[in-house]
Interface confidence: medium
């Protein structure tokens, strides 16, 4: 078959057109999908007649044309082109095989920015380590919740790495989970080991009921022990009713004889009789991720005399269905400030949240948000994304609820919404955030930090920068320099000191002329590339009496690299016994290419030096 020539679809630094051509072949249906794949998805690959004549862009291809590409073809594409393909597959809702997903993920080397545009199930194959930091991981795992985790068998390495990363992201320490944690884990909750089942039975057992596939041995034993123990949510087996048995559906196989013998025999008989008539109980419902409000909760009328006239302590004695039936959502919204003072259980708070969700499906108004109090802990990042929080008072009130705990995904999302709403990270906001989370500033990406106005830098304390990396300090330093520019020498140094990890060489040279006596801890945080050009005299002036500390750090960067660049004679003038400088009679040639490869300067011995000197002399005479 003669193939027409094709120009590369994307410019790719010296790469031949072959990859693009192959891509056209598979994307236009020249490569047929396997029968099983086409059969499984109900989609069929397009025929190949004459489709290569005018190469279209990927987004114009039909699902049939996009289906069934083999991995070999993808490996020839640029990362950008792979991303384009992934987005098109998502837009067209093309069902992909595990192999295709794994292959695409492998080619998306950089962590993708636009997670929402990618096929949901593709995320299962991305490395969660690429999404570190509360905001990045929250976005990633919020999407994973919606993906079909069961595409991956339980033993698959991709699946095994997701759970620990998700637990770390959601801030779960130990084995105690809240209902919100379980909801946030989505299908990954089915992988939680037995110790979680033992310690968090109340919130986890109802989730395990709907897990597809059998629980492992460890989970089964823990579930059996929890059910036999008779704790919530199901209570002792001796008190179970037919509806309890219904609710337990998927866990029935793990019960074991001791438990079955404890269930009232009349209940077992009635349940067996009903389930033989209605076998639908065998299909565990998959919609357990949201708090479930059973039919009777929603439909039951409020008993007479129980209609709530106001939100008060009497409501703690209401059963869940009574709260649902007797508390008016509008009343709740107007009296939200009272909820926090009343010791509702988590289960009751779920009902109240459900009522607010029904009243405000597009997101709560700020008047309600400000008074959420502990109910804020029941909110998911998805809920919070619907909010428009503009008042600093609201932000403070909600941060107060989470005080003393690590930044949760809810808090990360709340802050993100608040800052985006304001358009920049102003001083008051930064003040508030760093008061609650000293490491907040360093959790932002360099791009996000670029929106911090210089005036806000006054709110930053040295400890707020402890965990910042050089890329973040590169962004913050120029802002700090601008903010503190009108201060005199010593005051300026005190303020700028914690930002110096982003300072260029010329600023360090200028500081060395001002007798600042920089301590060694600050010096060790300076950019290596900024320190290297400093002379011995400049470093001596910069450090003042602290220069003696160089000896203790001579093996560590940036001191080690700086020593390698200095003449040994000059180093000896410090009298510290620093070794490793350039010996006398050697000439340093800054061969940047060589240096970039080796990381050390190029040295020429005495022979070549004489030659160079002779050449210099000859050229001067000439």
């Amino acid at each position: 078959m003669a193939l027409p020539t094709a120009r590369p679809l994307l410019g790719s630094c010296g790469t031949p057109a072959l990859g693009s051509l192959l891509f056209l072949l598979f994307s236009l249906g020249w490569v047929q999908p396997s029968r099983t794949l086409a059969g499984e998805t109900g989609q069929e690959a397009a025929p190949l007649d004459g489709v290569l004549a005018n190469p279209p862009n990927i987004s114009s291809l039909s699902p049939r044309q996009l289906l069934g590409f083999p991995c070999a073809e993808v490996s020839g594409l640029s990362t950008e082109r792979v991303r384009e393909l992934a987005v098109a597959l998502a837009q067209k809702n093309v069902k992909l095989s595990t192999e295709q997903l794994r292959c695409l993920a492998h080619r998306l080397s950089e962590p993708p920015e636009d997670l929402d545009a990618l096929p949901l199930d593709l995320l299962l194959f991305l490395n969660p380590d690429a999404f570190s930091g509360p905001q990045a991981c929250t976005r990633f795992f919020s999407r994973i919740t919606k993906a079909n985790v069961d595409l991956l068998p339980r033993g698959a390495p991709e699946r095994q790495r997701l759970l620990p990363a998700a637990l770390a992201c959601w801030g779960v320490r130990g084995s105690l989970l809240s209902e919100a944690d379980v909801r946030a884990l989505g299908g990954l909750a089915c992988d939680l080991p037995g110790r979680f089942v033992a310690e968090s039975a109340e919130v986890l057992l109802p989730r395990l009921v709907s897990c597809p596939g059998p629980l492992d041995q460890d989970q089964q034993e823990a579930a059996r022990a929890a059910l036999q123990g008779g704790g919530p949510p199901y209570g002792p087996p001796s008190t179970w009713s037919v509806s309890t048995m219904d609710a337990l559906r998927g866990l029935l196989p793990v019960l074991g004889q001791p438990i079955i013998r404890s269930i009232p025999q009349g209940i077992v008989a009635a349940w067996r009789q009903r389930s033989s008539r209605d076998p639908s109980w065998r299909q565990p419902e998959r919609t357990i991720l949201r708090p479930r409000f059973r039919r009777e909760v929603e439909k039951t009328a409020c008993p007479s005399g129980k209609k709530a006239r106001e939100i008060d302590e009497s409501l703690i004695f209401y059963k869940k269905w009574e709260l649902e039936a007797c508390v008016d959502a509008a009343l709740l919204a107007t009296q939200m400030d009272r909820v926090n003072a009343i010791p509702f259980t988590y289960e009751q708070l779920d009902v109240l949240k459900h009522k607010l969700d029904e009243l405000y499906p597009q997101g709560y108004p700020e008047s309600v948000i400000q008074h959420l109090g502990y109910l804020f802990l029941k909110m998911s990042p998805e809920d919070i994304r619907k909010w428009n929080v503009t008042s600093l008072e609201t932000l403070k009130a909600l941060l107060e609820v989470n005080k003393g705990h690590e930044m949760s995904p809810q808090v990360a999302t709340l802050i993100d919404r608040f800052v985006k709403g304001r358009g920049q990270l102003d001083k008051d906001t930064l003040d508030t955030l760093t008061a609650f989370y000293p490491g907040y500033l360093c959790s932002l990406s360099p791009e996000e930090l670029s929106s911090v106005p210089p005036s806000s830098i006054w709110a930053v304390r040295p400890q707020d920068l402890d965990t910042c990396d050089p890329r973040q300090l590169d962004v913050l330093y120029p802002k700090a320099r601008l903010a503190f520019q009108n201060m005199n020498g010593s005051e300026y140094f005190v303020k700028i000191q914690s930002f110096l990890g982003g300072a260029p060489t010329e600023d360090l040279k200028a500081l060395s002329q001002q007798n600042v006596s920089m301590d060694l801890a600050t010096f060790m945080k300076l950019r290596t590339d900024a320190v290297l050009p400093l002379t011995v005299a400049e470093v001596q002036k910069l450090l003042g009496p602290h220069v003696e500390g160089l000896k203790a750090e001579e093996r560590h960067r940036p001191v080690r690299d700086w020593i390698l660049r200095q003449r040994q004679d000059d180093l000896d003038t410090l009298g510290l016994g620093l070794q490793g400088g350039i010996p006398n009679g050697y000439l340093v040639l800054d061969l940047s290419m060589q240096e970039a490869l080796s990381g050390t300067p190029c040295l020429l011995g005495p022979g070549p030096v004489l030659t160079v000197l002779a050449l210099l002399l000859a050229s001067t005479l000439a």
């Epitope: 105690l176 809240s178 109340e202 010791p343 259980t345 988590y346 289960e347 502990y374 802990l377």
Partner: nanobody
Framework: EVQLVESGGGSVQAGGSLRLSCTAS????????MGWYRQAPGNERELVAT???????YYVDSVKGRFTISQDNAKNTVYLQMNSLKPEDTAMYYC??????????WGQGTLVTVS
């Protein structure tokens, strides 16, 4: 590890009394609301009485005047004194803690039977 252990349940004639105890470990009562719940066969669990960290108490209407909830912070124990017991008080009684409203921790329960 946060744990609650109930004791004091048993069988009693109508009109009799029982005193339930619940001892907590793994946290202190200083910032906790404690409560007694009960669950009769085939029924949903219901709150009977609760005591706030500031000492204020609340009771469900059906036990007001008959039951008293109290706590001994030094012993990390909460009590439920039940007088004038009725057959409808028969249930499994659970102690519960709302610790900083962040988690609800339950005990294993103690059975009260009134004949």
């Amino acid at each position: 590890e946060v744990q609650l252990v109930e004791s004091g349940g048993g069988s009693v004639q109508a009109g009799g009394s029982l005193r339930l105890s619940c001892t907590a470990s793994g946290f202190t009562f200083d910032d906790s609301d404690m409560g007694w719940y009960r669950q009769a066969p085939g029924n949903e669990r219901e709150l009977v009485a609760t005591i706030r960290s500031d000492g204020s108490t609340y009771y469900v209407d059906s036990v007001k005047g008959r039951f008293t909830i109290s706590q001994d912070n030094a012993k990390n124990t909460v009590y439920l004194q039940m007088n004038s017991l009725k057959p409808e008080d028969t249930a499994m009684y659970y102690c519960a803690s709302l610790w900083l409203r962040r988690l609800v921790c339950w005990g294993q329960g103690t059975l009260v039977t009134v004949s």
